[in-house]
């Protein structure tokens, strides 16, 4: 059973390339259409003409590109996380909204509440949910900073979720934080706003308790331009999740093999 | 190309598991002696006879056992990755030294200093290190707390590298940080004294930034115990690294395929 | 998961991730690793059917992608998915290492 | 590592990280998918040698164990070890979707 | 796929009583896995569930009652007082909202003195 | 809280008749509310989830219907077999609550 170094892929052996290559490109037609859970390509007959709508390009931009913080490993993959996600997003809730008001003068943060009526909107039902991730777009910033994110726990606790080293940039940059463990309790919760805060990372000895981060959306000087691309940017949930008709399909015909 | 259900490990195929087995022990042999880089096995005239030392069982021990913080994921094995890693420790500085006079009265963190020398010991090359992890025994508690660890960066300033919530517990618990980058570092730097800090998170508003945990071998009231249990359960560095002959053999004999 | 708690306790003939345990004497002759005195080595093994589809049963052959042939390979093989490291206790002459050898424990296979 | 960068730009016969561009027009046949129009899904080829030793050299073989046989196993097959997702827009009826599938394109691969 | 409790018998009041439900045929990182009780003659009542991350939740008369947690194939109730008021049939649930869930045979608790 | 209430506690009717059961929340739930039968002796069985989707095996005499705070199970042709208690359960919070089922219905064929 011992294979020889001269098993090579020689040029006699151009066709098996050929062939394999056929096989896989078939292979990934079957690939597809399983984790779609679709029998066969669908149907093209209602689709409106013309280009996609902009928010529906921008929300594929979003999931494609890759943001300082969202980890590009390997995904293990259990049985669930096979098939295809519905990819959504939820924006924060907006600035002028009152619940902002207590939160204006606080130089060490900044804070984004999210409707979780909004959120479960996409997904009904908390276990269909597979990834969340907050987004923020980060102005440019010549300051390095090492920033903190906490969760609203109860009336005037908030819970540590993470940090980060945010180096200087000559160009706005986009953020992203796991948040799926939080979402998913919102979800368990009920209806209500819930949500984020954004700080500095303040350690015990030091003076300097500023956040000099400017994020799109929040940060005071720009409140004024709420243009349609600024709002496009204001802080989001990505959100992951099976599509219900999906989980029950996938439910209903699952089998021992 | 199809392969059908019924391809299965049927009963007139038992004969192939036997003969799996016994390649798969057979590819362990040339496994274990490839990643020791040996060509046979190792012979055993000067063995001292009677049972292995204490301390090397300790080290084997510690090697063996997951520790809260260890990542247990599969490693990804990049080529220098194959081969085998000889295991070391290296204890903190003893806490009677001059060294911790000034960090004594600090309620906030607790100080552990390592001597570069006694680290290049056991690395003598900064490339051949693999992994450095700082192992702390956290003592039986009843509080949470949220700590964080630093590494002394320059005169008086402190570089953030980590961060644990630390649940109640009713057993003493070992702490594992992965500390390689800061130690290879160390190694670069040439000798000296070298420290980390472990410290409360203090956030932006927090009044009680005291630290609640107690670390064997550092927390004030079992300074009296030095006993040789006990001084093997001070903080230490786990090191995992290319033993020297190995690496200059690794290197003599690499050849791109 | 096709790991060490699903298939050891199953008798699935897929693929699948099959006890080994590796006695160093008895197995390999060896008395020259003092500990441990073997380990739980495992090994993938079974077929990755339904790779490709035959036109009469195309729904089937997808609904079985997710088990048999995940990442769409043109001939998908049973291999480890999780391994885990194994250190061991060794004399160099008068001098005991202590040594970790990494991905030497399979705890579960998958079709790739 | 066998990854696109090193497999893409050498020779490599053993084990190695395959081009392979999929356009699902011209490939697939399909029109549903509206982004992307194609994407680099790539494969893994190539023979894991070395894998039994002949006594005659079995110093060689050793050696060549970190690449062709890394996890000793019984017969050791080329296959990824990094994958990547990929997002698609297709339409369900008149909505537009935006799906991620998971492990979809290889970025490496090893002998395992 | 299948569940199975295990651990009900006889318990004098005050001793801490674990149950165990065993799992198998599925990953319970895609599921909600809940407790629920029914005292004889009575009611269904939900006492809490561990979630596809490991959070708890608990129903708030259960809370510091009850103890819920999980392993790869394990789910585990453990009871840290239990009263003769617990005495009931125990009931372990595997839940998704979105499909039909699965439920366990039950295994008896009884607590008297 | 989520509280459900059910209604009516017991009901008697004849076979081959129709059984309506009420369950009603006390905040929205939206359509998370599942149905379940339980036989004396047995564990529940489900019938309905998502408040209208049948469970796979459930005849289709049982239905259900409602969202937001009040739902209802219907149970058409009513045979003997059908003998048994009702619960509710809704699966829209976990947070903060005394039950997530309904108090039960327990329906005797005359």
């Known amino acids: 059973d011992y294979k020889d170094d001269d098993d090579k892929l020689s040029t006699s052996k151009t066709i098996d390339m050929e062939l394999v290559k056929r096989k896989r490109i078939e292979a990934i037609r079957g690939q597809i259409l399983s984790k779609l859970r679709l029998a066969s390509p669908p149907s093209q007959g209602e689709v409106p003409p013309g280009p996609l709508p902009e928010a529906v390009l921008a929300l594929y931009n979003s999931t494609r590109d890759r943001v300082a913080g969202e980890s590009a490993d390997p995904e293990p993959e259990p049985e669930a996380d096979y098939y295809a996600k519905e990819v959504t997003r939820v924006l924060m809730v907006d600035r002028n909204n009152a619940i902002y008001e207590k939160t204006k003068d606080i130089s060490h943060s900044i804070y984004m509440f999210f409707n979780t009526s909004d959120i479960r909107e996409a997904v009904p039902e908390p276990p269909l949910l597979s990834r969340a991730e907050l987004r923020l777009q980060r102005l440019k910033s010549s300051v390095e900073q090492h920033v903190e994110l906490y969760q609203k726990y109860s009336n005037n606790s908030w819970r540590y979720l993470g940090n980060r080293l945010l180096t200087p940039t000559d160009t706005p940059e986009w953020l992203s934080f796991d948040v799926t463990g939080v979402v998913r309790q919102w979800l368990n919760q009920g209806d209500g706003i819930q949500g984020f805060r954004f700080s500095a990372h303040c350690s015990c000895d030091s003076k300097d308790n500023k956040l000099h981060v400017e994020i799109n959306g929040i940060s005071p000087k720009r409140r004024g331009d709420l243009g349609t691309i600024h709002d496009m940017n204001r802080p989001f949930l990505l959100l992951m999740a099976t599509p219900l008709e999906r989980a029950q399909h996938l439910h209903s015909s699952r089998h021992r093999r | 190309d199809y392969k059908d259900d019924d391809d299965k490990l049927s009963t007139s195929k038992t004969i192939d598991m036997e003969l799996v087995k016994r390649k798969r022990i057979e590819a362990i042999r040339g496994q274990i002696l490839s990643k020791l880089r040996l060509a046979s096995p190792p012979s055993q005239g000067e063995v001292p006879p009677g049972p292995l030392p204490e301390a090397v069982l300790a080290l084997y021990n510690s090697t063996r056992d997951r520790v809260a913080g260890e990542s247990a994921d599969p490693e990804p094995e990049p080529e220098a990755d194959y081969y085998a890693k000889e295991v070391t420790r290296v204890l903190m500085v003893d806490r009677n030294n001059a060294i911790y006079e000034k960090t004594k009265d600090i309620s906030h963190s607790i100080y552990m200093f390592f001597n570069t020398s006694d680290i290049r010991e056991a690395v003598p090359e900064p490339p051949l290190l693999s992994r450095a992890e700082l192992r702390l025994q956290r003592l039986k508690s009843s509080v949470e707390q949220h700590v964080e660890l630093y590494q002394k960066y320059s005169n008086n300033s402190w570089r953030y590298l980590g961060n644990r919530l630390l649940t109640p517990t009713d057993t003493p618990e070992w702490l594992s940080f992965d500390v390689t980058g800061v130690v290879r570092q160390w190694l670069n730097q040439g000798d000296g004294i070298q420290g980390f800090r472990f410290s409360a998170h203090c956030s932006c508003d927090s009044k009680d930034n005291k630290l609640h945990v107690e670390i064997n071998g550092i927390s004030p009231k079992r300074r009296g115990d030095l006993g040789t249990i006990h001084d093997m359960n001070r903080p230490f560095l786990l090191l995992m690294a290319t033993p020297l002959e190995r690496a200059q053999h690794l290197h003599s004999s690499r050849h791109r395929r | 998961a096709l790991d060490t708690n699903y298939c050891f306790s199953s008798t699935e003939k897929n693929c699948c991730v099959r006890q080994l345990y590796i006695d160093f004497r008895k197995d390999l002759g060896w008395k020259w690793i003092h500990e441990p005195k073997g380990y739980h080595a495992n090994f993938c093994l079974g077929p990755c059917p339904y790779i490709w589809s035959l036109d009469t049963q195309y729904s089937k052959v997808l609904a079985l992608y997710n088990q048999h042939n995940p990442g769409a390979s043109a001939s998908p093989c049973c291999v480890p998915q999780a391994l885990e490291p194994l250190p061991i206790v060794y004399y160099v002459g008068r001098k005991p290492k202590v040594e970790q050898l990494s991905n030497m424990i399979v705890r579960s296979c998958k079709c790739s | 590592a066998l990854d696109t960068n090193y497999c893409f730009s050498s020779t490599e016969k053993n084990c190695c990280v395959r081009q392979l561009y999929i356009d699902f027009r011209k490939d697939l046949g399909w029109k549903w998918i509206h982004e992307p129009k194609g994407y680099h899904a790539n494969f893994c080829l190539g023979p894991c040698p070395y894998i039994w030793s002949l006594d005659t050299q079995y110093s060689k073989v050793l050696a060549l164990y970190n690449q062709h046989n890394p996890g000793a196993s019984a017969s050791p097959c080329c296959v990824p070890q990094a994958l990547e997702p990929l997002p698609i827009v297709y339409y369900v009826g008149r909505k537009p979707k935006v799906e991620q599938l998971s492990n979809m394109i290889v970025r490496s691969c090893k002998c395992s | 796929q299948s569940l199975e409790e295990s651990g009900g018998r006889l318990v004098t009041p005050g001793t801490p009583l674990t149950l165990t439900c065993t799992t198998s045929g599925f990953s319970l990182n895609n599921y909600y896995m809940n407790w629920v009780r029914q005292a004889p003659g009575k009611g269904l009542e939900w006492i809490g569930l561990t979630d596809n991350d490991g959070t708890t939740y608990y129903a708030n008369w259960a809370k510091g009652r009850f103890t819920v947690s999980k392993t790869s194939t394990t789910v585990d109730l453990k009871m840290t007082s239990p009263t003769t008021e617990d005495t009931a049939t125990y009931f372990c649930?595997?839940?998704?909202?979105?499909?039909?869930?699965?439920w366990g045979p039950g295994t008896l608790v009884t607590v008297s003195s | 809280a989520y509280d459900m209430t059910q209604t009516p506690a017991s009901v008697e009717v004849a076979v081959g008749g129709t059984v309506t059961i009420k369950c009603q929340a006390s905040?929205?739930?939206?359509?998370?509310l599942a149905w379940y039968q339980q036989k004396p002796g047995q564990p529940p069985k489900q019938l309905i989830y998502?408040?209208?989707t049948l469970a796979s095996g459930v005849s289709s005499r049982f239905k259900g219907s409602g969202s937001g705070t009040q739902f209802t199970l219907t149970i058409s042709g009513v045979e003997c077999a059908d003998a048994a208690t009702y619960y509710c359960q809704q699966t829209y919070s976990w947070s903060g609550l005394d039950n997530v089922f309904g108090g039960g219905t327990k329906v005797e064929i005359k």
């Open positions: 905040q929205s739930i939206s359509s998370s």
């Open positions: 998502r408040a209208s």
């Open positions: 649930v595997r839940d998704a909202g979105y499909s039909r869930n699965l």
